[in-house]
Every structure is written in structure tokens, then in C-alpha cells.
Interface confidence: low
Amino acid sequence: HHHHHHHQGWQAFKNDATEIIPELGEYPEPPPELENNKTMNRAENGGRPPHHPFETKDVSEYSCRELHFTRYVTDGPCRSAKPVTELVCSGQCGPARLLPNAIGRGKWWRPSGPDFRCIPDRYRAQRVQLLCPGGEAPRARKVRLVASCKCKRLTRFHNQSELKDFGTEAARPQKGRKPRPRARSAKANQAELENAY
């Protein structure tokens, strides 16, 4: 088997958001900019007036889904010896139905109010061995992978880069990178997937 011919496709699943981290362990996302979920109905946190037709539900009932995503980790020209499996957070954190408006003639989605998003809740660190072309010595790295997702309330201070919808971002072509037959990004693959339906 010619399994050493990795370098032809090593960039195929590069995830530019992969973070090399210094310590191993499981830890939650830093929470300073996120308010406690339990505060969602208090008036000082954007609670709705009593006449509002939307009945409050526990955030856990919303469809924040954890999708498996398998890829190789890359660092420059080096690629992990094995693929890693992580989670992608997907879905909406809000009512899944249309609601009657105040005068009963039309339908509306939930009005503006507390903004909850399906975003990473916990991360895990995984040690990976990166194989490099040209006889370079393998490198040991630790990468941060999403371990769980949660509906979390956002504030205006929340880092918006966390909030990109994976499917939308994935379908967007990468800039400044010429396509090669074997060097297909996960984003290009997702576009291929969507076009296949």
C-alpha cells in the first residue's frame, strides 16, 4: 500500500479555525460575554411584556444539534496521522413554529429579544501527531476541538466570529486559493455535497 503519499491531499481538510493549544484537558468556553441562560425572562435582560403570545420554553428544548465532522488537522504542509472527529454546532435556538401576530391576521417569527445561538459550549484538547513531507520529523501538537454545543445567550460584546453558520460558511468558495484536484477543502466539499442533492 502506498499510504505514504499523503502530501498530495494534505490540504484537503484544512480548517483555518483549528487552534493549537498549550495544555491538554476539557474546559468550557470562556463565559464572560455570555449571560446565564436562566436569566432569559427577567425584565432587565430583555424580558417580554406579559401580553406577548410567545410562551417561554427552556432553552434546552430548542434544536441546537451536534453534528459530527471528521477531518485531518493540518499545520502548514504537515497533516495529522489520523483524522479527528469533532462536533459542529447547528440549528436555531428559538421556537420552531410561526406565531400569530397581535391582531391575528398574519404570522411572525419570534420578535427581537434575548438572542440565543447554538454555539460551542465545551472544548476538548486532543494530542495529534503531524506528519510532514520531505522527511521532516513528525510534530506533536494539541488541538482544540468542539466537544459539546449549547443554546447560549449572546450580548453585544460576544465575539461574532463564533457565530458563523457552518453550512453557509462552508458553501462559500475560499478566496485566494486555486483549486487542485486533490486539495479540496472541507468548504469546497460541502458545496459539492449541496450541489449533489
Partner: nanobody
Amino acid sequence: EVQLVESGGGLVQAGGSLRLSCATSGFTFSRFDMSWFRQAPGKQREFIATIFSGGDTDYIDSVKGRFTISRDNAKNTVYLQMNSLKPEDTAVYYCCPLGIEYAWGQGTQVTVSS
């Protein structure tokens, strides 16, 4: 919708062979690198082998020389030929395309008795 259906598992004695198949749909199979994973009871899912879109292959050390991954792009199917099976190969085996958001298939159980 991406669909992955694994089959071919079963009960076999140590030293025996099995051929697993994974029928896929919902994506352009020939463009994707395909992997087999396995999960033994109480253990994490682990990578077994990958076949790249161009045909190159890659294996975990513990199965090199015993397992062979192959693909049939016309049938949108990936295979795993497993020879010289050992009790420690007992697990549920899963296939998946790399680089796609997906839900795992149901897997196929392989049990190797000593």
C-alpha cells in the same frame, strides 16, 4: 441527505476474514476521501483506514497488512477487507466521508471469537 449504510459484519473465529461494505448516497462519492472507523465497547471511536479520492490508502498501524480498504466509484461504495482477524478487532465498524457534516450510519457489528 447524506446516507451511509454499513453491512457485512458478523461473528467469525480468530484468523478468519470478513468483507465490510458501505453504500453511500447524497453526495458526490468520487470526490471524497472515505474512512472506516470502529468503536469497541467502552472505548472511543478510532480511525482504521482512509482511501483518498485519488486511490491512495492510509491505515492505522494495528491493521496494516491485515485490512485492505478499497472503493468502487461506480457503485458509490467503499469496502474493508479484513483478514487474520483478532479478538481485539471486535467492534462496531462505521464508514464516513471526510469533510462533510454528517450523522454516523448505524454501523455493522464485527465479533471475533477466540
